[in-house]
């Protein structure tokens, strides 16, 4: 009774289609699978960025897998063939591992790459990225930004750079159709007659870097002798009301400062009849129902009331 063996996949490789970090892992079937042609062979794939402590593990019947990686670091992957126990009348049989690596040969020293890269998706409408030139680079150095997300045929270059002293220090992006809730890949590379420039790679999701506009139309409404309702409207733009959190700052008679975080466009404040002045400002942020992270908006214009009319039912600016 001979021991059942299976070969590892052939030609295991990592392919870079030019999508700035979204890579293809692909392989060919092992040879000598005819003994198992009634049986579906599976593959166990493990991969990670070099330096990461944990492997991502996938079991698949396919001959390829796609995922995003940090191209600032190398990538390592390994794969073996699995014959399920149904194929072997007993325990699962595994081949030896086939291994491969991939990295982009770095040009230039690390200090030449862009510094302090910062990207903000203003009001879920306009993406703007800015950076500082690398340390010690000359004024002839220019940086170029390329981007890709699933849905684009190929990586695109920025067409509207922000410049300072003739150097590109930022990019205003065009309208990005169907670009949220998926990885957005950026590469900023550079050129200089003086020395090679190191490329930098960035990956994020646009909904996580949204900075909304501040709320508008702040109003007061007297609810009772000791309660005032503060109200405002969601900022203009595409962000739905269900996606907002708000932070309020309330000042009574120049002394008391109340801050609160709320999910709705109202806040009820306990007051006394002695209150002579009331001011509040609000800012907004995309909440956890619509993103994993976000940036607070600027504060709204201050809305104040002072004088005896505070006891009346509605106070408008």
């Amino acid at each position: 009774d001979t021991e059942i063996k299976v070969n590892p996949p052939q030609d295991f490789e990592i392919v870079d289609p030019g999508y700035l970090g979204y890579l293809y892992l692909q392989w060919q079937p092992p040879l000598s699978l005819d003994h198992f042609k009634e049986c579906t062979v599976e593959y166990e794939l493990k991969y990670r960025n070099i330096g990461s402590e944990t492997w991502k593990t996938i079991i698949t019947k396919n001959l390829h897998y796609k995922d995003g990686f940090d191209l600032n670091k190398g990538i390592e992957a390994k794969i073996h063939t699995l014959l399920p126990w149904q194929c072997t009348n007993g325990s699962e049989v595994q081949s030896s591992w086939a291994e491969t690596t991939y990295w982009i040969s770095p040009q230039g020293i690390p200090e030449t790459k862009v510094q302090d890269m910062d990207c903000v998706y203003y009001n879920w409408q306009y993406l703007l990225c800015s950076w500082k030139p690398g340390i010690g680079v000359l004024l002839d150095t220019n940086y170029n930004l390329f981007y890709w997300y699933e849905g684009l045929d190929h990586a695109l270059q920025c067409v509207d750079y922000i410049k300072a002293d003739g150097q590109n220090i930022g990019c205003r992006f065009p309208y990005l159709e169907a670009s949220d809730y998926k990885d957005f890949y950026i590469c900023v590379n550079g050129s200089s007659e003086n020395k090679p420039i190191r490329s930098s790679y960035f990956t994020f999701q646009l909904q996580n870097i949204v900075k909304p506009l501040p709320p508008v139309y702040l109003t007061f409404t007297r609810e009772s002798s000791c309660e005032i309702k503060l109200k405002w409207s969601i900022p203009l733009g595409p962000i739905p009301a269900r996606c907002f959190d708000y932070e309020i700052e309330i000042r009574e008679d120049d002394t008391t400062l109340v801050t609160a975080t709320v999910e709705n466009e109202t806040y009820t404040l306990k007051t006394t009849n002695e209150t002579r002045q009331l001011c509040f400002v609000v800012r907004s942020k995309v909440n956890i129902y619509c993103s994993d992270d976000g940036i607070w908006s600027e504060w709204s214009d201050k809305q104040c009331w002072e004088g005896e009319d505070l006891s009346k039912k509605t106070l408008l600016r």
Epitope: Q10, D11, E13, I14, V15, D16, P17, Y24, Q26, Q28, P29, L31, S32, L33, D34, H35, K37, L63, H64, T100
Partner: antibody, heavy 118, light 107 residues
Amino acid sequence: QVQLVQSGAEVVKPGASVKVSCKASGFTFSSYGMSWVRQAPGQGLEWVGTISGGGSYTYYPESVKGRFTITRDTSTSTAYMELRSLRSDDTAVYYCARRDLRSAMDYWGQGTLVTVSS
Amino acid sequence: DIVMTQSPLSLPVTLGQPASISCKASQNVDINVAWYQQRPGQSPRALIYSASYRYSGVPDRFSGSGSGTDFTLKISRVEAEDVGVFYCQQYNAYPLTFGQGTKLEIK
């Protein structure tokens, strides 16, 4: 539909070099290996090399190893075979073919005649 | 290297009659065998992979069988467009090797 379009015929002198191209369309180029097969006048088929989908692996028979080099350019979906130090017995029609998932060759180009003659 | 030996090298067949081509490998190649047809003046065309599986678009009068070292290509009813040279090929190990070809002609 899958198409492989090869470059035109070449006439070269012994010892010279030539580069034959094969432009692919109708499929995801980087997902498939490409093989090259030659056919001398009136003779059968002879495999002369294979390159994997991503270009990481190349395979050649001993008869051409060191003289023939296969490369690929994903940006233009083109495979190339460079033939160096050519001899008269390298005269043949050179075919590119897509390697299917089993290393058989499922689609073939129209062929490029390379004539080595002094 | 694995040697693939085809027989017969020439096969005259009457239209509508069956035809059979044999291919023997010098060592075990499991089912890693393909068959190709080359019509006069044309590029080869893939017919069969993994010894017995037809490529899409290949008429079902073509069938392949075998494993290990012995393989057969059968044409159930030969048609005029089947004229040409048929090659077997093993891809079990590099270097990939072809049989020397079988020329099918109409009687």
